[in-house]
């Protein structure tokens, strides 16, 4: 029961996390104009991974996509790649984990197969979460670096002096959404991996005992075998009675759980 709960909770947490990663990737507020110590302006800039937006004081908002690949910073491209990889891995992980859920029966799928699928999806969620956290962290680092580098440079022109200032940008809402979502996906993945351990079936060896009657008076006695889990002290099946009976271990070196008397 605890295994099912852990697996189910891991799935739900990962689902929320991946939905968050998708939301963060699509959001426009990855970086927002830093208004602290800025002269009053009539526009507010904010940017995402895919487009740049401006909100005027009148309330009018306009966005324009980055219709180029070569003109974009390499770091931005790297962040895009990390987020997409995270989403793809997460989506595949979700698909695998649906079939791995203990509460869902699909044909005659064995517990060992479900355990393997649970582990696979768990690893996928972990990698997905790490990709999202890495992507958001790389972007945050880029913002911090730009923030301190955005100092005024003076260019002397023919008609006088022109001051070029790069507007300072700070963390947008998407970064926090991405960090939290990545963390949730990571936690969900860990939970799935923990659930996998509980799903793996215990090896039960049914060691059958064959009876060879030494005389005509000795009849076959049913129930002449014991099941052993292999974890107890009774790893060898004892003889039920004397009179030609010997354990299957003495006859067959590789007992199978399908060997019945």
């Amino acid at each position: 029961m605890a295994v099912t709960a852990c697996q189910g909770l891991g799935f739900v947490v990962s689902l929320i996390g991946i939905a968050g990663i998708i939301a963060a990737t699509c959001m426009d507020q990855w970086s927002t104009q830093d208004l602290y110590n800025n002269p009053v302006t009539a526009v507010f800039n904010y940017q995402g991974l895919w487009r740049s937006c401006v909100r005027e004081s009148s309330g009018f908002t306009e966005c324009r996509g980055y219709f180029t690949l070569l003109g974009l910073p390499a770091m931005l491209q790297a962040v895009r790649a990390l987020m997409i990889v995270g989403i793809v891995l997460g989506a595949i992980g979700l698909l695998v984990s649906i079939f791995a859920l203990k509460c869902i029966r699909i044909g005659s799928m064995e517990d060992s197969a479900k355990a393997n699928m649970t582990l696979t999806s768990g690893i996928m969620f972990i990698v997905s979460g790490l990709c999202a956290i890495a992507g958001v962290s790389v972007f945050a680092n880029m913002l911090v670096t730009n923030f301190w580098m955005s100092t005024a440079n003076m260019y002397t022109g023919m008609g006088g002096m022109v001051q070029t200032v790069q507007t300072r940008y700070t963390f947008g809402a998407a970064l926090f959404v991405g960090w939290v979502a990545g963390g949730l996906t990571l936690i969900g993945g860990v939970m799935m991996c923990i659930a996998c351990r509980g799903l793996a079936p215990e090896e039960t060896n049914y060691k059958a005992v064959s009876y060879h009657a030494s005389g005509h008076s000795v009849a076959y006695k049913p129930g002449g075998f014991k099941a052993s889990t292999g974890f107890g002290s009774n790893t060898k099946n004892k003889k039920i009675y004397d009179g030609g009976a010997r354990t299957e271990d003495e006859v067959q070196s590789y007992p199978s759980k399908h060997d019945y008397v």
């Epitope: 970086s31 302006t41 009539a42 526009v43 800039n45 940017q47 740049s52 401006v54 005027e56 009148s58 009018f60 324009r64 980055y66 180029t68 003109g71 974009l72 910073p73 931005l76 730009n146 955005s150 022109g157 022109v162 001051q163 070029t164 200032v165 790069q166 507007t167 300072r168 940008y169």
Partner: nanobody, 122 residues
Framework: QVQLVESGGGVVQPGGSLRLSCAAS????????TNWYRQAPGKGREFVAF????????TYADSVKDRFTISRDNSKNTLYLQMNSLRAEDTAVYYC???????????????WGQGTLVTVSS
């Protein structure tokens, strides 16, 4: 090379008018929002007016509303500020500034001119 050159400043009597111009070069003016700022002697820089890259969305500081008009001509790469009913408190150095509207995945650039002095005195 980026240049923003203001002109049209001077001495004017209270109630008079002036038209400031700002000629831009060295960048794609038509993709930049533009502003006028001013700095009175011994005071901080103050926002005066804004106009977006298409020539719409004009916004003004309360102190200049209904007296000043901002406009631009993208074909001439020039920004204008028509100042009417000037008062003594309008005395300041006026700066034009261009703000990149849609930067490509990096912080937008702001370009500032060197300023032109407007003195309102009788």
């Amino acid at each position: 090379q980026v240049q923003l050159v203001e002109s049209g400043g001077g001495v004017v009597q209270p109630g008079g008018s002036l038209r400031l111009s700002c000629a831009a070069s060295g960048f794609t003016f038509s993709t930049y929002d533009t502003n006028w700022y001013r700095q009175a002697p011994g005071k901080g820089r103050e926002f005066v007016a804004f106009i977006n890259y298409r020539g719409g969305g004009a916004t003004y500081a309360d102190s200049v509303k209904d007296r000043f008009t901002i406009s631009r001509d993208n074909s001439k790469n020039t920004l204008y500020l028509q100042m009417n009913s000037l008062r003594a408190e309008d005395t300041a150095v006026y700066y034009c500034a261009a703000h990149e509207r849609f930067p490509m995945g990096r912080p937008p650039y702001d370009y500032w001119g060197q300023g032109t002095l407007v003195t309102v005195s009788s």
